[in-house]
């Protein structure tokens, strides 16, 4: 339990870091949470008693004691950042603000049929932070139905004013709804020669790329490694932008690396969580505490447990000194990054893990898997669930995947003849079906959501969501898998596995131990040749060996086709149908999950 409620008619006194404009106190709280130092805030709502120039101001505050004196003030709303909370946090804001004009640089103006179309345009425009749309009731005729795309240095409006018959809102890039390409490559020996909007210190190009991703103006970056010839620029991370949204010039330079903001793929890769340790590296910054600690891991935990700590440096103990404990220096800075990075002094440095909760849980690294063999080991596929029916007797019905703490993604065809969700049980963290006894805990199903265009597996739309009655507490043996990014449509996945308790051959029985098989993806053209009597649509994806031998089969339906890309597992397919099992030149056909991301988000994020 953390302080999430807002304090009405209350102002926090002092501790000001900066002032931004937000359309609501709720969004002010989100901005505070994502700011590197903000712990509390005061927002001023519109009120006749308040000077209109102060309406919608969001004052971000910090305090050594995590609290500030409270003063009564009409129209002021105060609260705390979510940094102090351990729940998952999202910057996604789908709210539409009526009769508010959010000011910024109006860089694009076009006609749109609706506010929703204007918001989609903003979401799919690389520069857009927010928009204002003049409705068809807007007094000025030539401005009606005009969609203004806007951006600012901070990503928040420079001012907000009341204006009748307009609506405003934010880009939905942080809701994973952008169709922009997701370019994950880091280009070695490359400098992007475009204008710098900011610069920070970073230990490697990956951290630099993550910082670029959550910086509102950064579209791409250049990082100078510690071997860069100019000493003053070593470990410098340059955050960049351009009018076109792409680098205008690429210069070949040794010891520099460049890459792109991961904004369009941020829901499926970590961008806030810098979990690596940097050996023989010292991070400089303002000191918060110096503590004796057993190891650099223990030092990272201390940093994580101190809400104001952003990064740390651990100096290992000299032999037989201080009971083998080294010194742990907890540090912070104005922007969350070290003010300087030094090498060759023996320190081990890293960052707080407190910000990991701002990333999707699905990006957490899981246990290394055992390659080879067909039986899985515990914790190898923590998103895999077994869906049981209790009618007429209890048995395994289908597989499924955890995609959220109350959501299972599975196949629609699993529910043929299932009259009610009451007869369903979802078991997670299971390796062997024999573990399931009368008293084994399970999740009841509150609702079955079948795609309304589903008719039969072979004609597509074979996708369904199960809303659980209670939430899943994530552990090493039960945690979600990431959905693929829409910007990842062109990714070629080479490490894909199908898992399930299904038959090993066409006439068989459900397996006791969860089985796994590595299976290559097949192009839709190739797949279509193998299934002349069916239409293989772009909403399907196929996988299989030409010679057969490995495939999903009866009982695997609804389970995942999981593909590893850039160290993160993605739910690329849902086991759907095929002709026989593991037959030569008959690949398995799976629901192509990337084509249903919008549908999934619409259903799971519905209020």
């Amino acid at each position: 339990e953390c302080v999430t409620q807002l304090l009405k008619d209350t102002c926090f006194e002092g501790g000001d870091i900066t002032t931004v404009f937000t359309p609501s106190a709720k969004y002010c709280q989100v901005v505070c949470t994502y700011h590197p130092r903000c712990l509390l805030f005061t927002f001023t709502a519109e009120s006749p008693s308040e000077d209109p120039t102060r309406w919608f101001t969001c004052v971000l505050k910090d305090s050594v004691t995590e609290t500030l004196p409270r003063v009564n003030r009409t129209a002021a709303i105060s609260g705390y950042s979510f940094k102090q909370c351990s729940h998952q946090i999202s910057a996604c804001n789908k709210d539409i603000y009526v009769d508010l004009d959010m000011k910024g640089i109006n860089y694009n103006s076009s006609v749109a049929k609706s506010a929703q179309e204007c918001q989609e345009r903003c979401t799919d425009d690389v520069h857009c932070h927010f928009f204002t749309y003049a409705t068809r009731q807007f007094p000025s005729l030539e401005h009606r139905n005009i969609c203004l795309l806007k951006h600012t240095q901070t990503g928040t409006p420079t001012r907000i004013t009341k204006l009748d018959k307009v609506v405003s809102g934010f880009s939905l890039k942080s809701c994973a709804l952008s169709n922009l390409a997701c370019i994950r490559d880091i280009f070695p020996n490359t400098v992007f020669a475009d204008s710098n909007i900011d610069s920070v210190m970073a230990p490697d190009a990956f951290v630099c790329g993550r910082i670029c991703t959550h910086h509102p103006g950064c579209l791409f970056f250049t990082f100078f490694s510690q071997e860069w010839p100019k000493e003053s620029q070593r470990n410098l991370c340059l955050l960049k932008t351009s009018e076109s949204g792409l680098p205008s010039t690429r210069i070949k330079k040794s010891k520099a690396l460049s890459g792109f903001s991961l904004q369009s793929c941020r829901h499926s890769i970590p961008v806030f969580c810098h979990s690596s340790f940097y050996h023989d590296t010292d991070f400089l910054g303002e000191e918060l505490d110096i503590v004796a600690a057993k190891s650099h891991e223990a030092c990272q935990k201390l940093c994580t447990n101190a809400v104001r700590c952003q990064f740390f440096t651990y100096t290992p103990a000299q032999a037989s000194c201080n009971e083998g404990k080294g010194k742990c220096y907890l540090k912070l800075s104005s922007n969350g990054s070290p003010t300087k990075i030094l090498h060759g002094r023996g320190g081990i440095s890293g960052y707080t893990l407190r910000l990991c909760k701002m990333d999707n849980e699905c990006t957490t690294k899981i246990k290394p898997r055992i390659v080879g063999g067909t039986a899985s080991v515990r914790g190898e596929w923590p998103w895999q669930v077994t869906l049981h029916t209790t009618s007429p007797t209890q048995r395994h019905l289908c597989g499924g995947s955890i995609i959220g703490n109350q959501w299972i993604l599975t196949a629609a065809h699993c529910f043929y003849g299932v009259e009610s969700p009451k007869i369903l049980r979802v078991y997670s963290g299971i390796l062997n079906q024999s573990e399931i006894k009368e008293d084994t805990s399970f999740f009841g199903v509150q609702e079955i959501i079948i795609h309304d265009q589903y008719k039969m597996a072979e004609s597509g739309y074979d996708i369904a969501l199960l809303k659980l009655e209670t939430t899943v507490n994530y552990t090493d043996s039960q945690r979600p898998i990431c959905l693929p990014s829409k910007g990842d449509r062109n990714v070629i996945y080479t490490d894909c596995w199908v898992t399930g308790w299904g038959y090993r051959k066409l006439r068989d029985k459900i397996q006791n131990t969860l089985q796994k098989a590595k299976i290559p993806l097949v192009t839709n053209e190739e797949c279509q040749k193998r299934y002349r009597g069916h239409k293989i649509t772009h909403k399907m994806i196929c996988a299989g060996y030409r010679e057969g031998g490995k495939d999903a089969c009866k009982g695997d339906s609804g389970g995942p086709l999981s593909c590893k890309h850039n160290e993160v597992w993605h739910l690329v397919g849902i086991t759907s149908w095929g002709e026989g099992c593991a037959q030569r030149e008959r690949p398995g056909v799976y629901t192509n999950v990337v084509e249903y991301v919008d549908w999934i988000l619409e259903k799971t994020q519905a209020v």
């Epitope: 953390c2 004691t65 995590e66 351990s86 004796a292 447990n305 101190a306 809400v307 909760k357």
Partner: nanobody, 120 residues
């Protein structure tokens, strides 16, 4: 050198009360979140309660809600756990630890623990 010293444990009848203390030294007590964690005989560790560094935010496990109160005194570098309406299932070794018990805050520095025994 971080040192955590729990005290205040003992034997008590069901329904009774105890106040546990944890004195911390070797670190700036006030900047950390703190938790109480317990281990019953033959069981794993169970998070009991947490308090944030400012002291304004507290949280409790369902098993103890309404029966325990966590507090801190930053001036004395001390963490407290007031327990009342004790049940036999509260029998355990109680430890204080840095962190709020969230999944990414496991393992900080631990004290030796203080034994609480509740008999019927």
């Amino acid at each position: 050198q971080v040192q955590l010293q729990e005290s205040g444990g003992g034997s008590v009848q069901a329904g009774g009360s105890l106040r546990l203390s944890c004195a911390a030294s070797g670190l700036r007590f006030s900047i950390y979140d703190w938790s109480w964690v317990r281990q019953a005989p033959g069981k794993g560790l169970e998070w009991v309660s947490a308090i944030n560094s400012g002291g304004g935010v507290t949280s409790y496990a369902d098993s103890v809600k309404g029966r325990v109160t966590i507090s801190r005194d930053n001036a004395k570098n001390t963490l407290y756990l007031q327990m009342h309406s004790l049940k036999t299932e509260d029998t355990a070794v109680y430890y204080c630890a840095t962190g709020d018990g969230g999944s990414w805050y496991r393992d900080g520095d631990w004290g030796q623990g203080t034994q609480v025994t509740v008999s019927s």
